[in-house]
Structures are given as structure tokens and as C-alpha cells.
């Protein structure tokens, strides 16, 4: 006799208004009497419609929450698993049931903002900037909303960057406990003459940090050939162990690059009689602290003062 189990009921994908953080929820299946005491597990698969791979979750809960790219549609499917002690060790699964979440097609794609860029400056404040859609009327203006776990609801930007009295960016400060989790952004727009397509972005703040450049550079030469370079980590909240550095050394007309995770470096001079010996350095957040980062600007150049040439007094 083949054992069968029903799929979950009322599977749906819900948008609670958190800019891409969606709820996938369902109700238990109708279970026949002999399986009433059995543990039910649910196998949930979901993805953005353009993705070639599904995310798979096994859970006993009736809801699952995750972040999605709302620029694209979402599809999910779910089935019931009966625990093996209820089925004499055989695997019993229901058929799949499916649900989808379609994106709003309000407004043409040409009205959506372009070139959205966000940088988290020195792990302290976030600046996002964008360009208006390709074909928009002159009365079009844009509004930015953001949400991350810990906020009760999505918030609107309170400090817009403007060009010709139009919002072209936003600065966010005091983002408490906002890193190491998905940060969701929606930029929507309004015009009296046409609907504007919304644009969604999701990232993690620690991966888009642009630090201040290193400071207090110092260079010295020991034994006439050993170059010793030192610098200080920039001020701010980033722990020193989170930096990686790129150094450019200039010896007369020759320049070369080096890299380190420490804030000093020793190298050999290429030529004993070089008259010009300078270096500058930049930094970014390293792999210990984030998956990615943005290089700082280059520091000021620091040169060795110790050389005394034939024209020196």
C-alpha cells in the first residue's frame, strides 16, 4: 500500500512593505488520521525568476523570511515530507505546490533611475547617488526609502542630495546595528504626467566601505639600503585589523607597488644613490572583516628627508 501525504495549503509569497524582505508562508496539509502524530517537515525552494539555481530550505515552521531583488519576479515551491519513523523508513513526499510574486509593471523601464551607486564612507555614513531615468518629464522627482532588520518599518531619506532642485542622492547617518545584514533600498518617483518605475537595491554595508586615507606617513632609510615606511590607520570606527594597504614607492624615476595588511613595511632600495625616495599609500577593508571594499583615496606623498646631495648646505 503506497503511503501518500498532501502538500501544504495556501502557500503564498507576501510583501510586508520592507523593500524586498518577503514572507513565504503556508498552512499545514490535510493529514489523514493515521499520520496525525507524525512530524511534518517542509521542503521550500525559491528564487528570483532570472536565477539558474534555487535556494532550498528544510523547515518545520509555517513561515520563512528572506530578501529578494524586487526588480525581478519571485517564484517558490513547497512540498511536505513525512518523517521516516512514520513511514517504516521510506521517504514520503507530497507533490509540489507553487506560488509566485510578480513585480509591479507600473511605469516604463525608461523612467527608472540609472547608475545607482552607494558608498559607506569610513563605516560611518552612507551616500547613495543616482541619475534620473532616460525618458522622464521635467517634473519628475525621486524618493528613497530604506530598511534593514531592526527597523520597525521602511524609512524615508531625510537628507537628500539635490541638483537643480531634484533629488539625485541621499546621505544616511546614525545607522545603528545596520552592518552584517541585508540593507534594502527602494527609489521610487513621482510625476503628474506618467507613472515612474521603482528601483530596488540590496547590499551589506560592510562590503561597500570606503575608508579615509592613511595618515601620518613616515619614511626612513637604515644602513643606507633598508627603506622603512610607517603610517597610521585613519581615524574612525574601523578596527585596525580590518585594513589592507597598497603602497606606491617612488625612487627617482622608477615607481613600484607593494601590499600589506600591516601599517608598516620594509623594502630594499633599488639604487644606493637615488636622490628622490617617496611613497604614498591607500587602504581598504580586508577579507577578515568584509567580503569586499572600496579603496580609499591616496594619502599625501611622504618623502625621505635624509638625503644630502652635492647642493645641500
Amino acid at each position: 500500500l503506497e503511503i501518500k501525504v498532501n502538500p501544504p495549503q495556501d502557500f503564498e509569497i507576501l510583501d510586508p512593505g520592507l523593500l524586498g524582505y518577503l514572507y513565504l508562508q503556508w498552512k499545514p496539509p490535510v493529514v489523514i488520521e493515521k499520520f496525525k502524530g507524525c512530524t511534518l517537515e517542509y521542503e521550500l525552494k525559491y528564487r528570483n525568476v532570472d536565477s539558474d539555481s534555487w535556494k532550498t530550505i528544510i523547515t518545520r515552521n509555517l513561515i520563512y523570511k528572506d530578501g529578494f531583488d524586487l526588480n525581478k519576479g519571485i517564484e517558490g515551491k513547497i512540498r511536505t515530507h513525512l518523517s521516516e519513523h512514520c513511514t517504516n523508513g521510506s521517504e514520503v513526499q507530497s507533490p509540489w505546490i507553487e506560488a509566485s510574486y510578480g513585480i509591479s509593471d507600473e511605469g516604463s523601464l525608461e523612467t527608472k533611475i540609472q547608475d545607482m551607486k552607494c558608498i559607506y564612507y569610513n563605516w560611518q555614513y552612507l551616500v547613495c547617488s543616482w541619475k534620473p531615468g532616460k525618458t522622464v518629464y521635467s517634473d519628475t522627482n525621486y524618493t528613497m526609502f530604506f530598511w534593514y532588520e531592526g527597523l520597525d518599518h521602511a524609512l524615508q531619506c531625510a537628507d537628500y542630495l539635490q541638483h537643480d532642485e531634484k533629488n539625485v542622492g541621499c546621505k544616511l547617518s546614525n545607522l545603528d546595528s545596520s552592518d552584517y545584514k541585508d540593507f534594502f533600498i527602494c527609489v521610487n518617483g513621482s510625476s503628474k504626467l506618467e507613472p515612474i518605475r521603482s528601483s530596488y537595491t540590496v547590499f551589506q554595508l560592510q562590503n561597500i566601505v570606503k575608508p579615509l586615507p592613511p595618515e601620518f606617513l613616515h619614511i626612513s632609510v637604515e644602513n643606507s639600503i633598508d627603506i622603512r615606511m610607517k603610517w597610521s590607520t585613519p581615524g574612525g570606527p574601523i578596527p585596525p585589523r580590518c585594513y589592507t594597504y597598497e603602497i606606491v614607492i617612488r625612487e627617482d624615476d622608477i615607481s613600484w607597488e607593494s601590499a600589506t595588511d600591516k601599517n608598516d613595511m620594509k623594502l630594499k632600495r633599488r639604487a644606493n644613490e637615488s636622490e628622490d625616495l617617496c611613497f604614498f599609500v591607500r587602504c581598504k577593508v580586508n577579507i577578515y572583516c568584509a567580503d569586499d571594499g572600496i579603496w580609499s583615496e591616496w594619502s599625501e606623498e611622504e618623502c625621505w628627508e635624509g638625503y644630502t646631495g652635492p647642493d645641500s648646505k
Partner: antibody, heavy 121, light 106 residues
Framework: EVQLLESGGGLVQPGGSLRLSCAAS????????MSWVRQAPGKGLEWVSA????????YYADSVKGRFTISRDNSKNTLYLQMNSLRAEDTAVYYC??????????????WGQGTLVTVSS | DIQMTQSPSSLSASVGDRVTITCRAS??????LNWYQQKPGKAPKLLIY???SLQSGVPSRFSGSGSGTDFTLTISSLQPEDFATYYC????????FGQGTKLEIK
């Protein structure tokens, strides 16, 4: 579900070269730093190399610096390890691993099944 | 470079036992320490990160503690599936592993 599948291992002579690949699926590959970790037969784990999500930063253990090159092709969801000037002591199972991050720290949260590299004459 | 030393190298215990494995760093690594479990022929599996945070899906009988240079992994009541090799790993500077502790059935 997150999957990492290594390939490219095999037998190679000392001084030879080999390129390992790691095909990733089930997550947004370009958003994660990735790493290679190896394990010599009957021995412990040794971190080899790492690369940031965009590929812009790379890191190497001293034991492989100058001989191995890590790279990634985010359009193909694939991580690579080019191994040159191979030595007998490079013989190991090579694992591809994904970084997870917490407040100013990291760990390897997903691992592939490994591919065996044997360097012998 | 930072060295990680685990003790003991091997350990025999019985189902239901409480087991503690220690890991010592050659310099202070704050709480930047992770623990992994590896079974023969399989890839390592993350158990604990940041010295004491339990990875999602890992049974609560596993716990970690310590900071600075001395750390411990505790299994409160050994289960048959826990017999494996355990590794600590620091991520304070580069990424070094301990030599492993093999946990065997007594």
C-alpha cells in the same frame, strides 16, 4: 541550497602546473569572498588563498606565495586556483570554501567536497 | 604568524560523556576563533564562530568559550554522530588552524 563543486585535481610531476576550478551555485557568488583550504593526507587543514567578492583583492599563505594565483569569474560563478612550480608538499585535498562574516570577523560557512592533487614523479 | 595549538591530540570517550577540547593561540586573538568538525572523507563543517556563537543548525550540546589566547569547545553529552576530528581556526591575522583533535569511541 549552497553548493561548491571542485574539479581539476590529478597527478602532476614536481615543477608542473595545474588549475583547479570551483563551480558555485545557490547563492549570489559575486557577493562573497572565497577561499582555498587544503589538507595533506592524514594531516590537518591549511589555509592557502582567498579572494574578495569582486576579485579586486587577493591573499596568500607564505607557503604558496609567488607560485599560486587565485582568481574568479563572477559571470560563470566559478573560483580558480592556478598552481605552478608544484612541489611534493603541495600534495593534498584542496577544498573551496565560502566566507561568512560577522562583526569584524569571518569564518568558512560552506565547503566543497574537495579535489585531490598529487605531486609525484 | 599566529600558531594554534590544540589539546589533546586525541581523546577517547563514551556516548553521554561531557567532553572539552582546548585551543591556545600564540598571541591574543580577541574572540576571532572558530571551531569545525570533520568526519573521514568529508569536508569540515562549521560549529562555532566568534569563540562562542553557535552556527545555525548545530545542536545546542556544542558550546564554545574563551577569549585572548585560551579557548574551549565543549560537547555536553556526546552522541554517536559526534565522533570526528575537531579543528579550531583563528581569523585575527591570516587564517590558521589547530592541528586537530580526534575524538574516538572508548
Amino acid at each position: 541550497e549552497v553548493q561548491l563543486l571542485e574539479s581539476g585535481g590529478g597527478l602532476v610531476q614536481p615543477g608542473g602546473s595545474l588549475r583547479l576550478s570551483c563551480a558555485a551555485s545557490g547563492f549570489t557568488f559575486s557577493s562573497y569572498a572565497m577561499s582555498w583550504v587544503r589538507q595533506a593526507p592524514g594531516k590537518g587543514l591549511e589555509w592557502v588563498s582567498a579572494i574578495s567578492g569582486s576579485g579586486g583583492s587577493t591573499y596568500y599563505a607564505d607557503s604558496v606565495k609567488g607560485r599560486f594565483t587565485i582568481s574568479r569569474d563572477n559571470s560563470k560563478n566559478t573560483l580558480y586556483l592556478q598552481m605552478n612550480s608544484l612541489r611534493a608538499e603541495d600534495t593534498a585535498v584542496y577544498y573551496c570554501a565560502r566566507y561568512g562574516h560577522y562583526a569584524y570577523g569571518s569564518y568558512f560557512d560552506y565547503w566543497g567536497q574537495g579535489t585531490l592533487v598529487t605531486v609525484s614523479s | 604568524d599566529i600558531q594554534m595549538t590544540q589539546s589533546p591530540s586525541s581523546l577517547s570517550a563514551s556516548v553521554g560523556d561531557r567532553v572539552t577540547i582546548t585551543c591556545r593561540a600564540s598571541q591574543s586573538i580577541s574572540s576571532y576563533l572558530n571551531w569545525y568538525q570533520q568526519k573521514p572523507g568529508k569536508a569540515p563543517k562549521l560549529l562555532i564562530y566568534a569563540a562562542s556563537s553557535l552556527q545555525s543548525g548545530v545542536p545546542s550540546r556544542f558550546s564554545g568559550s574563551g577569549s585572548g589566547t585560551d579557548f574551549t569547545l565543549t560537547i555536553s553529552s556526546l552522541q554517536p554522530e559526534d565522533f570526528a576530528t575537531y579543528y579550531c581556526q583563528q581569523d585575527y591575522y591570516l587564517f590558521t588552524f589547530g592541528q586537530g583533535t580526534k575524538l574516538e569511541i572508548k
